[in-house]
């Protein structure tokens, strides 16, 4: 079956937006006014994953780019990266596990847990202009809560 997708932007709980930082990295910073146009638009695809009452498996691609957030081991540490894919084959219903995040939503606040590395979350730093990364702690200094804004297709 063809995969269902929605376009959206994400901001962390401090209202930092996500923008490209070089070809294969995202960073989080506060944007205002016309600068908001810099923020990346994600195509959130609803994919197959493990059954759970409160977790929805999604893949996060960059709209109209053949790039997906993925989770891999680098130097033995779970790491977030932007991975280039063949646009003829993606998105698809059965995404490889490294591309899958469990969307956990409570009161319109979203967390994105790596399906490949349970208890590791898409995270931002408190500091401005720092890379978006995969963090292994929740509720600490680093930010794991996001809000989502729909974007027209």
């Amino acid at each position: 079956a063809p995969v269902r997708s929605l376009n959206c932007t994400l901001r962390d709980s401090q209202q930092k937006s996500l923008v490209m930082s070089g070809p294969y990295e995202l960073k989080a910073l506060h944007l205002q006014g016309q600068d908001m146009e810099q923020q990346v638009v994600f195509s959130m695809s609803f994919v197959q994953g493990e059954e759970s009452n409160d977790k929805i498996p999604v893949a996060l691609g960059l709209k109209e780019k053949n790039l997906y957030l993925s989770c891999v081991l680098k130097d033995d540490k779970p790491t977030l990266q932007l991975e280039s894919v063949d646009p003829k084959n993606y998105p698809k219903k059965k995404m490889e596990k490294r591309f899958v995040f469990n969307k956990i939503e409570i009161n319109n606040k979203l967390e994105f847990e790596s399906a490949q590395f349970p208890n590791w979350y898409i995270s931002t730093s408190q500091a401005e202009n720092m890379p978006v990364f995969l963090g292994g702690t929740k509720g600490g200094q680093d930010i794991t809560d996001f809000t989502m804004q729909f974007v027209s297709s």
Epitope: A1, Q48, V58, F150, V151, S153
Partner: antibody, heavy 120, light 107 residues
Framework: QVQLVQSGAEVKKPGASVKVSCKVS????????IEWVRQAPGKGLEWIGE????????NYNEKFKGKATITADTSTDTAYMELSSLRSEDTAVYYC?????????????WGQGTLVTVSS | DIQMTQSPSSLSASVGDRVTITCKAS??????LSWFQQKPGKAPKSLIY???RLVDGVPSRFSGSASGTDYTLTISSLQPEDFATYYC?????????FGQGTKLEIK
């Protein structure tokens, strides 16, 4: 609590159009798909299409493309479905329903239905 | 389009009986399967979504299960208010499609 309140019954002549409304309360309108379903007299349920008010994404059943036009007004939390070029076979009860934007929860809430009768 | 073949089309049973209604999908629907109850002149009422998750407020005598592309609604002990028509729905792929319905009547 969640409520979907639909407009009242309509009687229309063949060839006319009708616009059915579905006014929503009790949840964040922009985050739920509004689904439209029809049921002809004594028949089963048939899916027409859906709209996500948050970004105006619309998906139609091919069978109803050109027949149904689905819209939403986020200022009034109301969704609409307009049916054009009505024929007797469009006589049916039309329902709106909802599903969360991530498709997880099924068509949980339903409007009471709007009977559209097409008769000369 | 995905076909949802629902059986039986009608069923007579008594209060206290255990009844099962089946829907067979013509292809994989990734567990995007709901069950509805409808009484004459009323809107459908959602019972179950994602195969087996009970909608809030629905009695626990209703349950859902799956085996491959076969999906089953079970009512463990029929109550007088359960006599109605039941529909399944796949919402995995456009167009979403309903089963033809099963009319559950008092024996």
């Amino acid at each position: 609590q969640v409520q979907l309140v639909q407009s009242g019954a309509e009687v229309k002549k063949p060839g006319a159009s009708v616009k059915v409304s579905c006014k929503v309360s009790g949840y964040t309108f922009s985050r739920y798909w509004i689904e439209w379903v029809r049921q002809a007299p004594g028949k089963g349920l048939e899916w027409i299409g859906e709209i996500l008010p948050g970004n105006a994404n619309i998906n139609y059943n091919e069978k109803f493309k050109g027949k149904a036009t689905i819209t939403a007004d986020t200022s009034t939390d109301t969704a609409y479905m307009e049916l054009s070029s009505l024929r007797s076979e469009d006589t049916a009860v039309y329902y709106c329903s909802t599903i969360y934007y991530d498709y997880d929860q099924g068509f949980t809430y339903w409007g009471q239905g709007t009977l559209v009768t097409v008769s000369s | 389009d995905i076909q949802m073949t629902q059986s039986p089309s009608s069923l007579s049973a008594s209060v206290g009986d255990r009844v099962t209604i089946t829907c067979k999908a013509s292809q994989d629907i990734d567990r995007y399967l709901s069950w509805f109850q409808q009484k004459p002149g009323k809107a459908p009422k959602s019972l179950i979504y994602r195969v087996k998750r009970l909608v809030d407020g629905v009695p626990s005598r209703f349950s859902g299960s799956a085996s491959g592309t076969d999906y089953t609604l079970t009512i463990s002990s029929l109550q007088p208010e359960d006599f109605a028509t039941y529909y399944c729905l796949q919402y995995d792929e456009f167009p979403y499609t309903f089963g033809q319905g099963t009319k559950l009547e008092i024996k």
